[in-house]
């Protein structure tokens, strides 16, 4: 997970949902048992703070050591702080836990800015509003890193949800989730509901709301509204999607779809922006300016960079376009999309807004490694990662943001042709240096 | 080369409005590139923005004078205007218009400026 | 809001001499900050933005430095005609309101 450019994200309470839920779709497919209904107490089992992270408390060792641990979707490593660091309140003491074993190997993990480095163990492992069981996990303990740990984020490590191919040291390294499916009865799936506040949110403010869900094991109804639709994970490493086509305002980028997906698309819960390649950056970004003409917004906004207020409660949210993304269905030739409101993509900023201001920052950013759907999209949506059917749902998230105008939307189907032609196929080569920096 | 020039009265009443305008010559105000804008500086003090319009009509302005305050631009005479009511002897300073160039954050371009001294 | 902090207040300095004036952000404002010289009469005239880049026609002897908090306008050899008040201004958040209070550099 690579922080400075890979940042995490915002969190926090959410606005109601819009108007009544919308009826299920008649031939949804029937779930195995167990799957699908309440899954009361892991509902709300997520805290965060705006642009550091959404974490869920996670116990290790025995006696069990309590720990706030970074969700991460786009990386495959269960690693947790193991020695002092100013900014941990806590960290992992494997010298008090009778069941911690040294696997006698270490791990280095350097990203585009930062690093950290451990040592590989394991130790038993839950997650006390999760599925009531007990694993043996693998952990990395981080003893050394830099630019990793974020000042205040109140997380000690981090959970990668994503696949052994990206694991590291190297892929024969169990990540948590497949131990977590092979020692339990948990189905292989897991949920995300992520509820960007809309507003700052203070340290106090951070600790007592909600920040969301991670349903472990299944499908929690109450998370989201309409149907959920899914799209196919073309590739087990991260959560590699296929985009098809993108829209502002519903106007076609009319690029050719191997752009969106070049060199990948990934759904990653640890990138706080919705990062797009550099040629789909640039005519988003025109197509957004382009929309909210009316006004005229400096170039360092466009950047990421700089922040823009308006008085309290008199931000234009109507100035700014939709944006929707078109995803490849289960179906041949059958497509969906999903759509963000500005009330997503605009990300509000703390410890700079007086009572006076609402400032934001624009959440969406350029890369080198592919479109990244971080908390900008998840915000908007109740995402599955249905890993036993290698697939992703979407569905409007309960707890999104929104006006009284326009709603978040996951809508389909729409005939799209080709589909299988907009996955980019990265060189074997290419692979080793992509994934040592995500930049 | 583009100039800007302010214009209106130098004596207000406590009470009446304040109007200024500024002229744009050697260039369009319609441009897409600026915003333009008010500045002020009581005698002896700092800098205060006002506020800043872009050629479409959009305006952003002070909060601490928005209660006050109204921007205008006219295209057709390449003018922007600023109105300031309900004035008081705390309002009396040199007015300046500006151009917000660079990127749309700096001031690049400013007018002379104009004393406006609210007396009775 | 961020405030930003000019020091000193007046500067006393001989022709030749150079010239550090000081700018402090309450919160980090990035590179977003600019610098402008007020003559006496006079209305102000960019010098340097972006933290560091010379407006046009600003001459060499002019540079600006810093990031996040902490700034510095340097006048390597100060010339009789760089007599004035310099403000610094943050454009972090926009629109760009906030002005420092002024550091006056005077004729010792």
């Known amino acids: 997970t690579q922080h400075g450019i890979r940042l995490p994200l915002r969190s926090g309470l959410g606005g109601a949902p819009l108007g009544l839920r919308l009826p299920r779709e008649t031939d949804e497919e029937p779930e195995e048992p167990g799957r699908r209904g309440s899954f009361v107490e892991m509902v709300d089992n997520l805290r965060g703070k705006s642009g550091q992270g959404y974490y869920v408390e996670m116990t290790v060792g025995s006696p069990p050591q309590t720990l706030n641990i970074l969700v991460d979707t786009g990386s495959s490593n269960f690693a947790v702080g193991a020695a002092p660091h100013p900014f941990l309140h806590r960290y992992y003491q494997r010298q008090l836990s009778s069941t911690y074993r040294d696997l006698r190997k270490g791990v280095y993990v350097p990203y585009t800015q930062g690093k950290w480095e451990g040592e590989l163990g394991t130790d038993l492992v839950s997650i006390p509003h999760g599925p009531n069981v007990t694993v043996r996990a693998n952990i990395a303990a981080i003893t050394e890193s830099d630019k990793f740990f974020i000042n205040g984020s109140n997380w000690e490590g981090i959970l990668g949800l994503a696949y052994a191919e990206i694991a590291r040291p190297d892929d024969s390294l169990e990540p948590f989730f497949d131990s977590l499916v092979k020692q339990t009865h948990v189905p292989n799936l897991f949920s995300l509901q992520l509820c960007g506040a809309g507003f700052p949110l203070n340290q106090s403010e951070v600790l007592a709301s909600v920040g969301g869900s991670m349903i472990i094991g299944g499908i929690d109804h109450s998370l989201y509204t309409g149907s959920l639709w899914y799209t196919p994970i073309r590739r087990e490493w991260y959560y590699e999607v296929i985009i098809v086509r993108v829209e502002i305002n519903g106007q076609d980028l009319k690029m050719d779809c191997k752009e969106y997906n070049y060199d990948k698309s990934i759904v990653d819960s640890g990138t706080t922006n919705l990062r797009l390649p550099k040629k789909v950056f640039e005519a988003a970004v025109k197509s957004i300016k382009a929309a909210s003409s009316t006004e005229k917004f400096p170039d360092g906004f466009w950047l990421g960079e700089q922040l823009v207020c308006w008085q309290a409660g008199t931000t234009p949210w109507n100035i700014f376009p939709v944006i929707s993304l078109y995803l490849m269905g289960e179906v041949t030739n059958q497509s969906f999309r999903i759509t963000i409101l500005p009330q997503q993509y605009l990300r509000p900023v703390e410890d700079v807004a007086t009572s006076q201001d609402d400032c934001y920052k624009f959440a969406i950013s350029q890369s080198s490694t592919g479109t990244v759907m971080g908390a900008v999209i998840m915000e908007g949506f109740y995402v599955v990662f249905d890993r036993a059917r290698k697939r992703i749902g979407f569905a409007v998230s309960a707890c999104h943001v929104h006006d009284e105008f326009r709603t978040a939307a996951v809508e389909g189907p729409f005939v799209t042709l080709d589909m299988e032609d907009c996955g980019y196929n990265i060189p074997q080569t290419d692979e080793s240096t992509l994934m040592t920096g995500r930049a | 080369q583009l100039q800007l020039q302010e214009s209106g009265p130098g004596l207000v009443k406590p009470s009446e409005t304040l109007s200024l305008t500024c002229t744009v010559s050697?260039?369009?105000?319609?441009?897409?590139?600026?915003?333009w804008g008010w500045i002020r500086q009581p005698p002896g003090k700092g800098l205060e923005w006002i506020g800043m319009?872009?050629?479409?009509?959009?305006?952003w302005y002070n909060p601490s004078l928005k209660s006050r305050v109204t921007i205008s631009v006219d295209t057709s005479k390449n003018q922007f205007s600023l109105k300031l009511s309900s004035v008081t002897a705390a309002d009396t300073a040199v007015y300046y218009c500006?151009?917000?160039?660079?990127?749309?954050?700096?001031?690049?371009?400013w007018g002379r400026g104009t004393l406006v001294t609210v007396s009775s | 809001e961020i405030v930003l902090t000019q020091s000193p207040a007046t500067l006393s300095l001989s022709p030749g001499e150079r010239a550090t004036l000081s700018c402090r952000a309450s919160?980090?404002?990035?590179?977003?900050l600019a610098w402008y010289q007020q003559k006496p009469g006079q209305a102000p005239r960019l010098l340097i933005y972006?933290?560091?880049k010379r407006a046009t026609g600003i001459p060499a002897r002019f540079s600006g430095s810093g990031s996040g908090t902490d700034f510095t306008l340097t006048i390597s050899s100060l010339e009789p005609e760089d007599f004035a008040v310099y403000y610094c201004?943050?454009?972090?958040?926009?629109?760009?309101?906030?002005f420092g209070g002024g550091t006056k550099v005077e004729i010792k």
């Open positions: 972006g933290a560091s």
């Open positions: 201004q943050q454009v972090y958040t926009w629109p760009p309101r906030t």
């Open positions: 319009i872009y050629y479409s009509g959009s305006t």
């Open positions: 050697g260039g369009s105000i319609s441009s897409s590139s600026y915003y």
């Open positions: 919160q980090s404002v990035s590179s977003y």
């Open positions: 500006a151009r917000v160039g660079h990127g749309v954050s700096y001031f690049d371009l």
